[in-house]
């Protein structure tokens, strides 16, 4: 539980920028939570650098991170999940920089999965469904989802739809006929917990039907 580095100590080290960012994942492995931190500057020499978290822990003062290549990682049940923890970059017993962080405000959900799109011929729409592991969780259960879709040929023209459920209906008339679409989804905490967008789900690809010339409607695939 060292304090900050004293003036004159570690002179070379102090020339570097040790700013870092972290995210937490709750109940990521059964009842275990995880905390992942990394330096914002990818060129930092991390050889002798360690991370330590102190405070807001259950029946321990501090925990040390494991180093996994460029990231630092903890998996534990010992987060109180209230109040701020002190997360420090250390070399030996000296702290180079510290941040006070409430782990409930840096939550990154797990990516949604099983994304699929089903065309309903009679309704002339597409039903988008996906799954999230958070439905089964005790803590981060309420999420906002961001569904993004684009015509495959439009590199950066994504259309985004925010929703709190895991089902979305896209009207056929809003899409181009006979076109290939890419769709993906990500999630962010939306109640009590705060934090970051999850990684995107794997993309799903679907084709819209041709227009049926006699009726002016699209043909099903």
């Amino acid at each position: 539980e060292s304090g900050y580095a004293q003036n004159g100590d570690l002179e070379d080290a102090e020339l570097d920028d040790y700013s870092f960012s972290c995210y937490s994942q709750l109940e990521v492995n059964g009842s275990q939570h995880s905390l992942t931190c990394a330096f914002e500057d990818p060129d930092v020499n991390i050889t002798n650098l360690e991370f330590e978290i102190c405070g807001a822990l259950v029946e321990v003062k501090c925990l040390n991170f494991r180093k996994l290549q460029e990231i630092y990682f903890i998996e534990t049940k010992k987060f109180l999940l209230i109040g701020k923890s002190n997360i420090c970059v250390k070399v030996g017993e000296k702290s180079l920089t510290c941040k006070k962080i409430d782990l409930t405000t840096i939550v990154k959900p797990e990516a949604p999965f099983d994304l699929s799109v089903v065309y309903r011929e009679g309704a002339n729409d597409f039903v988008v469904t996906f799954n999230t592991s958070h439905l089964q969780k005790k803590y981060v259960k309420v999420l906002m989802h961001d569904v993004a879709y684009r015509q495959e040929k439009d590199e950066n023209k994504w259309t985004h739809v925010n929703l709190s459920s895991t089902k979305l209906t896209l009207l056929q008339r809003k899409l181009q006929p006979a076109a290939m679409y890419e769709i993906k989804v990500r999630s962010i905490p939306d109640h009590y917990f705060k934090g970051f967008w999850s990684e995107w789900s794997p993309s799903y690809y679907f084709r819209t039907p041709e227009i049926n010339n006699s009726s002016g409607e699209m043909d099903p695939i």
């Epitope: 539980e1 060292s2 304090g3 102190c54 405070g55 807001a56 822990l57 259950v58 029946e59 321990v60 003062k61 501090c62 109180l80 999940l81 209230i82 109040g83 701020k84 002190n86 006070k100 409430d102 005790k138 803590y139 009590y192």
Partner: antibody, heavy 119, light 105 residues
């Protein structure tokens, strides 16, 4: 205003259990830890444990682990401390204290509950 | 477990004098808090995170220190300052010092 109101004094026999309540008002009960601190007559302060009212997670001083149980009822913003297998040296004033999660100090205290253990 | 030793146990001073209370930790502590307690009353938060004054605490009080050595200073004692002061570490198991009693000489 922010207030913690504790239950009244108790007299117990050795080997018995005691349960002290602490009713919170004037703030969001689930937003702060509730800590329990005791003070034997003429002695200093001793932290016993805390509970996170949001999720019920507890953290105990190893000295009391196995004898103290902290619970809460969020519907009535009340925390409880139960101490079992009482001994005469458990005679003390028991305080509940709200934990400030930004700095981890006890920023609001209850008035105290005197527990006397005597045969 | 960290042990916090407060000295002196009793400080006998007159109103208007300067009071210096010490809290020594058996190993390094990042942050220290201080509480004031008067007879028959619950403790009150006094100084938190080494040097921040709790709400309503007069500016004649100050806190300082780092590592294993922390100090609470009262620049000029007022009658209402005579009480017991406890230091406390910020982290589990939130250990308190044994207290320093500031009494009227």
């Amino acid at each position: 205003q922010v207030q913690l109101v504790q239950s009244g004094a108790e007299v117990k026999k050795p080997g018995a259990s005691v349960k002290v309540s602490c009713k919170a008002s004037g703030y969001t009960f689930t937003g702060y830890t509730m800590n329990w601190v005791r003070q034997a007559p003429g002695q200093g302060l001793e932290w016993m444990g805390l509970i996170n009212p949001y999720n019920g997670v507890t953290s105990y001083n190893q000295k009391f682990k196995g004898r103290v149980t902290l619970t809460r009822d969020t519907s009535i913003s009340t925390a409880y401390m139960e101490l079992s297998r009482l001994r005469s040296d458990d005679t003390a004033v028991y305080y509940c204290a709200r934990g400030d999660g930004n700095y981890w100090y006890f920023d609001v205290w209850g008035q105290g509950t005197t527990v006397t253990v005597s045969s | 477990e960290i042990v916090l030793t407060q000295s002196p146990a009793t400080l006998s001073l007159s109103p208007g004098e300067r009071a210096t209370l010490s809290c020594s930790a058996s190993s390094s502590v990042t942050y220290m808090h201080w509480y004031q307690q008067k007879p028959g009353q619950a403790p009150k938060p006094w100084i938190y995170e080494i040097s921040k004054l709790a709400s309503g605490v007069p500016v004649r009080f100050s806190g300082s220190g780092s590592g294993t050595s922390y100090t609470l200073t009262i620049s000029s004692l007022e009658p209402e300052d005579f009480a017991v002061y406890y230091c406390q570490e910020w982290n589990y198991p939130y250990t308190f010092g044994g207290g320093t009693k500031v009494e009227i000489k």
